[in-house]
Amino acid sequence: FKVATPYSLYVCPEGQNVTLTCRLLGPVDKGHDVTFYKTWYRSSRGEVQTCSERRPIRQLTFQDLHLHHGGHQAAQTSHDLAQRHGLESASDHHGNFSITMRNLTLLDSGLYCCLVVEIRHHHSEHRVHGAMELQVQTGKDAPSNCVVYPSSSQDSEQIT
């Protein structure tokens, strides 16, 4: 399987909310002995590779923000902790999973990574990640709403 990032760049005004999204693609083993662990974290372009460094998102670690389930079951973080930090991660039946960040500040700018771990018991873990950039802007040059740039081309879309 692979992880796709529909948008590689999100440009948002301060105070706006944004939902960063990843999508699980390809054949997903729905067997009883396969489970998935999905999470989010901040990173950098990488000492070893992009997303190899794991930093907290608003002081919450990848452990705090994880989703867990088998196959394509829906899941959502029920953590009061995440919601207190203006964060919520969720997953649907179609392989999409996301993190919503509320009331953005300039400090939220940076590289964000989604991580999917396919756990094949008796074999090994298979890790795949996706990366996307968030730019939070303020002042007269800031957009009125979030503008997202698709990964495949530089055509932008405005999210209202």
């Epitope: 009883h32 002995d33 489970t35 662990y37 000492e47 070893v48 590779q49 190899s52 460094e53 794991r54 990848f62 452990q63 994880h66 867990h68 088998g70 991580l115 771990v117 756990i119 018991h121 008796h122 074999h123 090994s124 873990e125 890790r127």
Partner: antibody, heavy 117, light 107 residues
């Protein structure tokens, strides 16, 4: 704050079955691997196996024929059974939480098990 | 199974000195390697995961590096509480395996 506590007999006779339980407190047993690791006196660490919260297990091939790990989510406990023990199984036995794509981040304090007649 | 070889077996240093510990894998483990500290009579404590990510609450004097088969744990300036045994552990394949340990002792 999640804490782990091992319990069980400290002395087991050769050829018998070693049975230990690990109680998880202060957090959920969901979404992690729950492992057993042992350390013979003065030696290094050996991973015995894990049970995932879903009930799936994975054992070290060197011990697989003798090991059973089970979980009781209602009690937030997981257990180790090691059959046909010998003196070579004398060790400190640790239970630990293992995070997918990470490492053993929380350990019990360990319990010494001596195999002797 | 993947064999991890740690060197040196013992490192004799004084407080304030820099400690460099090595872990070599019998085959590539990518960057899926962790480091633990263990003091006498205590359980191991996670220091580093994925070669260089510090675990929660670990001081900045501990740093990890490397990928593939060769890894290093560096303690930039030894504090009295850092004298202990250090283990590396791989997680690219099961069974999970540990190195034999490096003892950092006071010179």
């Amino acid at each position: 704050q999640v804490q782990l506590q091992e319990s069980g007999p400290g002395l087991v006779k050769p050829s018998e079955t070693l049975s230990l339980t690990c109680t998880v407190s202060g957090g959920s047993i969901s979404s992690y691997y729950w492992s057993w690791i042992r350390q013979p006196p003065g030696k290094g660490l050996e991973w015995i196996g894990y049970i995932y919260y879903s009930g799936s297990t994975n054992y070290n091939p060197s011990l697989k024929s003798r090991v059973t790990i089970s979980v009781d989510t209602s009690k937030s406990q997981f257990s180790l059974k090691l059959s046909s023990v010998t003196a070579a199984d004398t060790a400190v036995y640790y239970c630990a939480r293992d995070i997918p794509a990470s490492a053993f981040d929380i350990w019990g304090q360990g319990t010494m098990v001596i195999v002797s007649s | 199974e993947i064999v991890l070889t740690q060197s040196p077996a013992t490192l004799s240093l004084s407080p304030g000195e820099r400690a460099t510990l090595s872990c070599r894998a019998s085959q590539s483990v990518s960057y899926y390697l962790a480091w633990y500290q263990q003091k006498p009579g205590q359980a191991p404590r996670l220091l580093i995961y994925d070669a260089f990510n510090r675990a929660t609450g670990i001081p900045a004097r501990f740093s990890g590096s490397g990928s593939g088969t060769d890894f290093t744990l560096t303690i930039s300036s030894l504090e009295p509480e850092d004298f202990a045994v250090y283990y590396c552990q791989q997680r690219i394949n099961w069974p999970l395996t540990f190195g034999g340990g490096t003892k950092v002792e006071i010179k």
